[in-house]
């Protein structure tokens, strides 16, 4: 009975397996209602080809226990071969096979595009013994598929070491259409033309696309995807979405905000962050960009001061960091800051402008006409000097700094003073006899010490010699002086 | 890149046999049917038949039984078509191509040209 | 066997122009499940032939918007609505709701 199924294998009207009409009843319901289901048709082998290389589906015949017949070929019965359906639908597919009741340990497994379907898939085998066969029949169910579900399924059966392997079946979801490029948010120069691309697949194709500006179609007709709006330019900003059509229904793409780009807002916030007799640092916030980027930023700043000639100082630096170190500006000054960016439009308005203060600056000129005596008899050195003339700026004289080195045998010190500013003369102890001691004054203020005065040099003899005259710093360009007792 | 490569050209003898090959590659070759397809100089297209390489099922034009026997080998994800008794009447290009989910040939190889001549 | 008979063998063109290709099978290519498994092929010269439309209407992916398919049962439409020079070659229809698959005879777009 079994040779004359295997017969009767022409009666399958076209081609077994793959063939996507190949079933002998109608199966429409399978492939065009809402929730598909297999189907399954009667027992049957399927036919082997002649001269075919490798069985592949076909298990070997074998000899049963008595010795007495063979067994015929195993292999999958045919099934549909095709599936089309929709989206979020729920389908369910089988593979049969008969096997003789010799045979025991049988497993079917599932295989997707080459891959075993293992875990959270509703797989379900069911057994339908016989006297002499058992029929088994496995389905396959997916419960609202999705794209991910696209694929060639087949059943693999286990048995005796041999692995029996059905024709597929393939799964094509159809759905709404999905979008590969959507338009994005652009930001555009007034009056002028630019592009938006979208694009949007099945199956099923065509997909149509209908352009929506500010929630009203832009174009009659429909274009075919992929389709490429072009606005000849906006006055002010918009919003495009593209509707993507096919069989199944409609997607709308995300809304999208095209901007019209203008100069930037004035930065706010310009606050001070550090002081200096010579520089301030600032920094801001930068104001709205006018959607397009800041290119750079410039920092004003006027001297606030009834005599000084209004003009204004420009520094540019980047956009980024929103911090700026304005530098060159005088000691003990006030300042009127204000700062501005750019775009490729054009520079925003200026910030509102804040007031700014330099600290005291250090005095710009030495103490002048430094002189040095020795006074053996009390083993000190008389020094004096007159007070420099500071500018406003440098602040007040808060005293004097006095450096005296000392150098005798390859033997170096050099100590400080600090003397007070009413001060125009000081004593310092002789630290070395028959040494060398060179003295420098430099006034100081608030603001930090000023340059030292050039310096004046004095011989310490040792004990027993007396110094006369005195040491004092040189007329300009002379030499560094040496007095000589 | 799901791709098909085809052996290079043929010049046979008549009465002998030729063996063409298919590579497949950028898809899993074991699920997908496998099509040869004829096409003589200046001629239209003609369907010699298929086989599926997960199991080795084939299924003849009846125009080629006797003629073509396809085989396949899933370690090399190679397919073949072997022509045998050839005549002049089949020298021709020679096609594989994969029948894809949407039932349709998807991709093809850049064909293998057989000339059978003494 | 369903014969498939496609129309013009040669259609002389001027780039731009809408090109119109018929194919006519012997026998109804719908098949039980509804679906209707007629595609077309261009086969550009030295080329293999490539998918264009599958399932009659359907473009394949990367296809252009000119080419589009209709037609349903046994005759089938081409549409190419402009011409451009990289169509040129032979077209083909292949149906494969029934064994064995048959090509049309194929159809040569030619400039005029």
């Known amino acids: 009975a079994i040779t004359e199924a295997r017969e009767e294998a022409k009666p399958y009207p076209l081609f077994p397996g793959p063939l996507p009409g190949s079933l002998q009843t109608d199966h429409t319901s399978l492939l065009s209602l809402p929730h598909t289901s297999g189907y399954q048709p009667a027992l049957m082998f399927s036919p082997t080809q002649p001269g075919r290389p490798y069985t592949g589906n076909v298990a070997i015949p074998r000899v049963t226990s008595a010795g007495s017949k063979l067994l015929p070929p195993l292999a999958f019965k045919h099934t549909v071969g095709h599936i089309i359906l929709s989206e979020h639908k729920d389908v369910k597919f089988n593979c049969s096979i008969s096997v003789p009741n010799i045979y025991q340990d049988t497993t079917i497994s599932w295989w997707k595009d080459g891959k075993e379907l293992l875990g959270a898939h509703h797989a379900i085998t069911q057994f339908y013994p016989d006297d002499e066969v058992t029929a088994i029949i496995a389905s396959f169910s997916i419960t609202s598929v999705q794209r991910s579900d696209n694929g060639s399924y087949i059943c693999k059966m286990k048995i005796n070491n041999e692995e029996i392997v059905s024709d597929p079946i393939y799964i094509e979801v159809q759905g709404l259409p999905h979008f590969t490029k959507q338009p994005e948010s652009m930001n555009v120069t007034r009056n002028t033309a630019f592009n938006l691309t979208c694009q949007a697949v099945g199956p099923p194709e065509p997909v149509n696309i209908f352009w929506v500006q500010n929630s009203s179609r832009v174009n009659e007709q429909p274009e075919k995807s992929p389709s490429v709006l072009t606005v000849p330019g906006l006055t002010e900003m918009a919003v495009f979405s593209c509707e993507a059509h096919n069989d199944k229904g409609l997607t709308v793409s995300k809304g999208v905000q095209i901007n019209i780009k203008a100069i930037p807002s004035p930065p706010t916030e310009v606050s001070i962050h550090n002081s200096t007799a010579h520089s301030i640092l600032i920094s801001w916030v930068p104001g709205f960009d006018g959607y397009s980027p800041f290119r750079n930023c410039s920092v004003q700043v006027k001297e606030v001061d009834p005599l000084s000639n209004g003009s204004v100082m420009i520094f540019n630096t980047s956009a980024s960091p929103h911090m700026y170190q304005i530098k060159q500006l005088q000691a003990l000054a006030n300042y009127s800051i204000g700062v501005s960016c750019m775009n490729e439009i054009g520079w925003s308005a200026v910030s509102p402008w804040i007031l700014a203060s330099t600290t005291e600056g250090a005095p710009s000129v030495a103490p002048l006409n430094v002189t040095v005596f020795l006074n053996e008899s009390r083993d000190n050195v008389d020094i004096r000097w007159m007070k420099p003339l500071t500018k406003r700026q440098a602040g007040e004289l808060v005293g004097y700094r006095i450096s005296h080195v000392w150098q005798s045998a390859g033997i170096s010190k050099e100590l400080l003073e600090e003397v007070g500013q009413n001060n125009s003369r000081a004593q310092i102890s002789v630290q070395v006899h028959n040494a060398t001691c060179t003295v420098r004054i430099a006034a100081v203020t608030k603001g930090g010490v000023g340059p030292f005065s050039d310096p004046v040099k004095i011989f310490i003899p040792a004990h027993g010699w007396v110094d006369h005259a005195p040491s004092s710093t040189p007329a300009p360009g002379n030499a560094d002086p040496v007095l000589i007792i | 890149q799901d791709q098909l490569q085809q052996s290079g050209p043929e010049l046979v003898k008549p009465g002998a046999s030729v063996k063409i090959s298919c590579k497949a590659s950028?898809?899993?070759?074991?699920?997908?049917?496998i099509h040869w397809v004829k096409q003589r100089p200046g001629q239209g297209l003609e369907w010699v038949g298929w086989?599926?390489?997960?199991?080795?099922?084939?299924k003849y034009n009846e125009r080629f039984k006797g003629k073509a026997t396809l085989t396949a080998d899933t370690s090399s994800s190679t397919a073949y078509m072997q022509l045998s008794s050839l005549t002049s009447e089949d020298s021709a290009v020679y096609y594989c191509?994969?029948?894809?989910?949407?039932?349709?040939?998807?991709?093809w190889g850049q064909g293998t040209s057989v000339t059978v001549s003494s | 066997d369903a014969v498939m008979t496609q129309t013009p063998l040669s259609l002389p063109v001027s780039l731009g122009d809408q090109a119109s290709i018929s194919c006519r099978s012997s026998?109804?290519?719908?098949?039980?499940?509804?679906?209707?498994?007629l595609h077309w092929y261009l086969q550009k010269p030295g080329q293999s032939p490539q998918l264009l439309i599958y399932?009659?209407?359907n473009r394949f992916s990367g296809v252009l918007d000119r080419f589009s398919g209709s037609g349903s049962g046994t005759d089938f439409t081409l549409k190419i609505s402009r011409v451009e020079a990289e169509d040129l070659g032979v077209y083909f229809c292949?149906?494969?709701?029934?064994?064995?698959?048959?090509f049309g005879s194929g159809t040569k777009l030619e400039i005029k």
């Open positions: 086989i599926f390489p997960g199991n080795g099922n084939t």
């Open positions: 950028g898809y899993s070759f074991t699920s997908y049917y």
């Open positions: 292949l149906q494969v709701t029934h064994v064995p698959f048959t």
């Open positions: 399932r009659v209407s």
């Open positions: 026998q109804s290519l719908e098949n039980s499940n509804g679906n209707t498994y």
């Open positions: 191509a994969r029948l894809g989910l949407i039932y349709a040939l998807d991709y």
